[in-house]
Interface confidence: low
Amino acid sequence: MAVTACQGLGFVVSLIGIAGIIAATCMDQWSTQDLYNNPVTAVFNYQGLWRSCVRESSGFTECRGYFTLLGLPAMLQAVRALMIVGIVLGAIGLLVSIFALKCIRIGSMEDSAKANMTLTSGIMFIVSGLCAIAGVSVFANMLVTNFWMSTANMYTGMGGMVQTVQTRYTFGAALFVGWVAGGLTLIGGVMMCIACRGLAPEETNYKAVSYHASGHSVAYKPGGFKASTGFGSNTKNKKIYDGGARTEDEVQSYPSKHDYV
């Protein structure tokens, strides 16, 4: 029962995590910038992996995709790739884990097969979660270390250019969503791997020995093991391995009014 609960909980946690990873990837608020704080000229900028947006004090919001002539910066592409890989692995993991759930019967699938599928999905969730955490961390690191630009080695300070008016950058909501979602997916994956250990019965190759006592016959199973319906080789669970990954690693803009350039 505990195994089924652990597996089910792992599945649900991973499902929430992957939904969060998808949400974070699609969100526009990866980094935010408040250029003017007074309520009259308040302009709020935020940007995501796919487009940048501006919201004026009037409430008017406009977003525009990153259309570039020479391709997007490598680190942004890397973050996109990590998030997409995380989503794809997570989605496959979810698909596999549905069939692996102990509470779902599919034909005459053995527990050993379900155990293997649970382990596979668990590892996929772990890698998916690590991808998401790595992707979000890369972006956050870019904001912290480069602050403004990616070619920090070209110039000094502010990633290179010298600015005349100070601006303030903050982590966007998507970063926190991504970190939490990645963590949940990773935890769900670990739970699936733990559940896998209990899914496959322990190997018990004990033969029933028949002893004839005086007057009546008793079947005795040595070692005080609980009676089980069958004997034979059951696959024992392998130890779960989980790896770790780290990674790290811009600028702003705003809308002009119609009379602006």
Epitope: S31, Q33, L35, Y36, T41, V43, N45, Y46, Q47, S52, V54, E62, R64, Y66, F67, T68, L69, L70, G71, L72, P73, L76, W148, M149, S150, T151, M154, Y155, G159, G160, M161, Q163, T164, V165, T167, E250, V251, Q252, S253, Y254, P255, S256, K257, H258, Y260, V261
Partner: nanobody, 124 residues
Framework: EVQLVESGGGSVQAGGSLRLSCAVS????????MGWFRQAPGKEREPVAF????????YYAPSVKDRFTISQDNAKNTVYLQMNSLKPDDTAMYYC?????????????????WGQGTQVTVSS
């Protein structure tokens, strides 16, 4: 679509001045930054100066800080680059650029729109 047309380039003696202009037309509402890049023969295109179109934010490469000034004239939809105390090292093709992006402005790939460029030659 946004069109950028540069003018004001030419030849000048070291220590002289030039003023580059970049006229912008088309759908400019969503533009957030405009800037000047330059590319010397056999070198990478590098950022020179940027200006935020909604305010007074200006950014300069350290090599041109205190010599170049970027400004905008909203009425004329034009951005200017005033270049003083020019050096032979400043010889390059100067490009006007505009972007809707918020990140990675030091990379040319983050700029959506480019002009054809105007040549600046500084002789010693």
């Amino acid at each position: 679509e946004v069109q950028l047309v540069e003018s004001g380039g030419g030849s000048v003696q070291a220590g002289g001045s030039l003023r580059l202009s970049c006229a912008v037309s088309g759908y400019t509402y969503n533009l957030k930054y405009m800037g000047w890049f330059r590319q010397a023969p056999g070198k990478e295109r590098e950022p020179v100066a940027f200006i935020y179109l909604g305010g007074d934010n200006q950014y300069y490469a350290p090599s041109v800080k205190d010599r170049f000034t970027i400004s905008q004239d909203n009425a004329k939809n034009t951005v200017y680059l005033q270049m003083n105390s020019l050096k032979p090292d400043d010889t390059a093709m100067y490009y006007c650029a505009a972007t809707t992006a918020l990140l990675f402005l030091a990379q040319t790939s983050s700029w959506n729109y480019w002009g054809q460029g105007t040549q600046v030659t500084v002789s010693s």
